[in-house]
């Protein structure tokens, strides 16, 4: 007997062919011998089956000796053996209908779990294999689970259900709600304005929720809330902001914060959390601020950085257009009795300059100038 696999909600066409290439009488019945449909001359007739309003055939094919049974909006319970009676012959087709659904909403927060559940007819023993948008394969039976969803898991998941050497493919669109970057680092000279941006990695019609930026300054013993805000239909409104520093926030997406001045006491790490309406859990983005200061005190030229720098970074002091006088993996370097000229303080990663501050050293009888 022929096996046909169908997808819940789809349409299936079961074929039945007579040896005579002309319109003759045929009937489609289910395994309980209940008539589904047939013909009387050129008219389509329907029986008392549950499929009544969803069953159809193609009259245009009858003259060629083809009498298909079309079932629309398939349901799992449509799984059955269908019998086509034509020319004193019986053709049996076993239809197996499967459904694959995501356990919850298909919009999931980064870090959450995705569970795909297979609906299958009794007596079937299918296997399922799903391929994520980033090419990761997962296998399972009735349920498949993916924990700790990542941003790269956003997109179309392709799942193949295998039964009796036949397969049917499902496509499920998953949206992982996350910030574009899990972490970012901003390098600034002391006194410069700081811009923090938190772009989202997804677009939705309406976006409503609330958020907060907690800041752990390197010099502080505990973290503090710098700003809280609400998000209503993509419009941002500030609820509460600290007096020091006095952050400013953009009114539209992407979420955007401005710190008027980069100061050593602000250097550190922040965590922006965003709670979305009707979602359990929060989106997170880490942001880091590194601040550089170059100073000259009497005969000592010093360069310092504050904030979360990697132990890979090199801090250097050099006279413009000359080799570095000092270049160390430290957060402070200095030169005693620096010669007059424009000195550069450089924070670099294997030659890539991340932050630069210039300080003019005047001949010993003058005061230094900070451009």
């Amino acid at each position: 007997k022929k096996v046909v696999l169908g997808k819940k909600g789809d349409t299936v066409e079961l074929t039945c062919t007579a040896s005579q290439k002309k319109s003759i009488q045929f009937h489609w019945k289910n395994s309980n011998q209940i008539k589904i449909l047939g013909n009387q001359g050129s008219f389509l007739t329907k029986g008392p089956s549950k499929l009544n309003d969803r069953a159809d055939s193609r009259r245009s094919l009858w003259d060629q000796g083809n009498f298909p049974l079309i079932i629309k909006n398939l349901k799992i319970e449509d799984s059955d053996t269908y019998i086509c009676e034509v020319e004193d012959q019986k053709e049996e087709v076993q239809l197996l209908v499967f459904g694959l659904t995501a356990n919850s909403d298909t919009h999931l927060l980064q870090g959450q779990s995705l569970t795909l559940t297979l609906e299958s007819p009794p007596g079937s023993s299918p296997s399922v294999q799903c391929r994520s948008p980033r090419g990761k394969n997962i296998q399972g039976g009735k349920t498949l689970s993916v924990s700790q969803l990542e941003l790269q898991d956003s997109g179309t998941w392709t799942c193949t259900v295998l039964q009796n050497q036949k397969k049917v493919e499902f496509k499920i669109d998953i949206v992982v709600l996350a910030f574009q970057k899990a972490s970012s680092i901003v390098y600034k000279k002391e006194g410069e304005q700081v811009e923090f941006s938190f772009p989202l990695a997804f677009t939705v019609e309406k976006l409503t929720g609330s958020g907060e930026l907690w800041w752990q300054a390197e010099r502080a013993s505990s973290s503090k809330s710098w700003i809280t805000f609400d998000l209503k239909n993509k419009e941002v409104s500030v609820k509460r902001v600290t007096q020091d520093p006095k952050l400013q926030m953009g009114k539209k997406l992407p979420l955007h914060l401005t710190l008027p001045q980069a100061l050593p006491q602000y250097a550190g790490s922040g965590n922006l959390t965003l709670a979305l309406e009707a979602k359990t859990g929060k989106l997170h983005q880490e942001v880091n601020l590194v601040v550089m200061r170059a100073t000259q005190l009497q005969k000592n030229l010093t360069c310092e950085v504050w904030g979360p720098t990697s132990p890979k970074l090199m801090l250097s002091l050099k006279l413009e257009n000359k080799e570095a006088k000092v270049s160390k993996r430290e957060k402070a370097v200095w030169v005693l009795n620096p010669e007059a000229g424009m000195w550069q303080c450089l924070l670099s990663d294997s030659g890539q300059v991340l932050l630069e501050s210039n300080i003019k050293v005047l001949p010993t009888w003058s005061t230094p100038v900070q451009p």
Partner: antibody, heavy 119, light 113 residues
Framework: QVQLVQSGAEVKKPGSSVKVSCKAS????????ISWVRQAPGQGLEWMGW????????NYAQKFQGRVTITADESTSTAYMELSSLRSEDTAVYYC????????????WGQGTTVTVSS | DIVMTQSPDSLAVSLGERATINCKSS????????????LAWYQQKPGQPPKLLIY???ARESGVPDRFSGSGSGTDFTLTISSLQAEDVAVYYC?????????FGQGTRLEIK
Amino acid sequence: QVQLVQSGAEVKKPGSSVKVSCKASGGTFSSYAISWVRQAPGQGLEWMGWINPNSGGTNYAQKFQGRVTITADESTSTAYMELSSLRSEDTAVYYCARASRGDDAFDIWGQGTTVTVSS
Amino acid sequence: DIVMTQSPDSLAVSLGERATINCKSSQSVLSSSYNKNYLAWYQQKPGQPPKLLIYWASARESGVPDRFSGSGSGTDFTLTISSLQAEDVAVYYCQQYYSIPIAFGQGTRLEIK
């Protein structure tokens, strides 16, 4: 696993230049600095300089300043070291090396390129 | 510039015995900011590029046998091979990467007695 594959041996005349290539395969090229280290026959290791392929930023050892140029081509994942005004004491095996763990201890090395400077 | 000095220049040790190589830097390679010693040890066999054994003065590179260990801090460092094997015959180098220029020691040749 990342591999660094260097160009073949070179024989050069004093006063000329040599350009050695180092091609990275099996990983992201621009994420980590590529250093050049040389070793004269029977001698120790000598760091010449490095390049950050991401920015093209370089640092050279004072000894080679003005004679060495390190470049990188991201499109081909290749780093180059050019040494000019060659002299007989530049005869050495030249290695490219990469630190892929986030410090500058070199965990991946090229196989080495022998450069012979002889009149 | 930091100068690295190794001792001894060559060393002969019996199979199964302990081998110890010392390395001294002219300045401290311990970063007070990051509390890390920027010192590595390499093994080089004839006709081969060097192979990283130890980084951060005492962290063993993956795949390196546990008979190799590194110790020390500031300016004085030691590479120890607890039980010498035939395949350990090589030249060993220490390297500082605390400041530019990066510098290597002159090397220690290890042989079997």
